[in-house]
């Protein structure tokens, strides 16, 4: 807290300019009018104030706008944004994508701070949904942004926004998130032809059900092992050896290296050994010949 002292004669700021850098903290407090500061916020970021000086300027703005800053001020905060607390930001009403971009730019290259997370939350809630332009912006600054959302939050993403998603944006998504995103992606890309569709949908396949994997196996897609290993175990288990062979194409040989890992391990346990032998990969652990396989889940459903 800066003490209230009278501004020295001749030091009253008539505009926000570089001379203010050479003011002591108490002089900034005494000689800079908060209303002047608010109307000339666009100049503040062009002047290399120390963070200590920015604290004084923030204090002045806080006094002028106790209910929260107007967007005209927020848009030009620049480095002053780094001084804001999540509590400060919760008072804001940010509606312009340009304002969001300007503030994200200040934090560029750093992990998402609590301030940025709060800002994004306020912005998205204000818009009502994660539209394509917003998603484009957020994933450009924070590739992992999408995967930081809960399945409930992801449900507000319209299918049209899925076009903005890049494969790396989904790297840290868990199966619950992909379960929500996959149907949206399927809808978004439904009018694409086979090979183009597969390229686009591939990153989302961790949320795909068995029937969609069966359909893909009929399209010569040659899924790579990395994608296969991310598929839902419950979606892979019902696939036949022939279907997996068609799904993977030349990549089927990679199953051997993954035979101890899910979902390959669990899938092998569900296949007849003689079917596995047809692959010629030496996969072991299938159901021995002559054994009867009872699907107890089916039996329970019938009773």
């Amino acid at each position: 807290e800066v003490e209230k002292t009278a501004c020295p004669s001749g030091k009253k700021a008539r505009e926000i300019d570089e001379s203010l850098i050479f003011y002591k903290k108490w002089e900034l407090e005494a000689c800079v009018d908060a209303a002047l500061l608010a109307t000339q916020m666009d100049r503040v970021n062009a002047i290399p104030f120390t963070y200590e000086q920015l604290d004084v300027l923030k204090h002045k703005l806080d006094e002028l706008y106790p209910q929260g800053y107007p967007e005209s001020v927020i848009q030009h905060l620049g480095y002053l944004f780094l001084k804001m607390s999540p509590e400060d930001i919760r008072k804001w009403n940010v509606t312009s994508l340009e304002t969001l971009k300007a503030l994200l730019e200040v934090n560029k290259g750093h992990e998402m701070s609590p301030q940025v997370a709060t800002l994004i939350d306020r912005f998205v809630k204000g818009r009502g949904q994660l539209d394509k332009d917003t998603l484009d912006t957020l994933t450009a600054f924070y590739p992992g942004y999408l995967c930081s959302l809960s399945p409930e939050e992801l449900s507000s993403v319209p299918p049209s926004s899925i076009w903005a998603v890049r494969p790396q944006d989904l790297d840290t998504c868990d199966p619950r998130q992909l379960d929500v995103l996959y149907p949206k992606a399927r809808l978004a890309f439904q009018n694409m032809n086979g090979s183009e569709y597969f390229v686009k949908i591939q990153s989302f396949l961790g949320g795909a059900p068995t029937e969609d994997l069966k359909a893909l196996s009929q399209q010569n897609v040659s899924m790579d092992l990395a994608t296969f290993m991310k598929l839902r175990t419950d979606a892979v288990l019902p696939l036949t050896v022939a279907e997996v062979q068609k799904l993977l194409g030349p990549h089927v040989e990679g199953l051997k290296a993954e035979e101890r890992h899910r979902p390959v391990r669990d899938w092998i346990l569900r296949q007849r050994q003689d079917d596995l032998d047809t692959l010629g990969l030496g996969l072991q652990g299938g159901i021995p010949n002559g054994y009867l396989v009872l699907d107890l889940s089916m039996q329970e459903a019938l009773s």
Epitope: P48, T50, Y51, E52, L54, Y79, L82, K83, H110
Partner: nanobody
Framework: EVQLVESGGGLVQPGGSLRLSCAAS????????MYWVRQAPGKGLEWVSY???????NVADSVKGRFTISRDNSKNTLYLQMNSLRAEDTAVYYC???????????WGQGTLVTVSS
């Protein structure tokens, strides 16, 4: 974090010259602006000069025409060339930096400049 070490201070006669240096280490790639700040005995901090990462610089009116700031990014070093020194320039001179990663200013321990005959 950024560490700063000033050097070059000492006793000099009025009208004389000194060159202060400030060596930065640590996360120097995040440094945005570097400052010289001084504190005369019994007085508050006074900003003397600054230079930004883009090369923009300025000096306080009290030292204009006498002090020059410069920065060697390859050596992560800040300099203050002080000419025509006066008794009122006697102070501890601190180097300070603003980074793009932490909303705090980093400071050196200071170097004492005494102008006296």
């Amino acid at each position: 974090e950024v560490q700063l070490v000033e050097s070059g201070g000492g006793l000099v006669q009025p009208g004389g010259s000194l060159r202060l240096s400030c060596a930065a280490s640590g996360r120097t790639s995040t440094i945005d602006t570097m400052y010289w700040v001084r504190q005369a005995p019994g007085k508050g901090l006074e900003w003397v000069s600054y230079v930004t990462s883009r090369g923009t610089s300025n000096v306080a009116d009290s030292v204009k025409g006498r002090f020059t700031i410069s920065r060697d990014n390859s050596k992560n070093t800040l300099y203050l060339q002080m000419n025509s020194l006066r008794a009122e320039d006697t102070a501890v001179y601190y180097c300070s930096v603003r980074t793009t990663s932490y909303p705090v200013d980093f400071w050196g321990q200071g170097t004492l400049v005494t102008v006296s005959s």
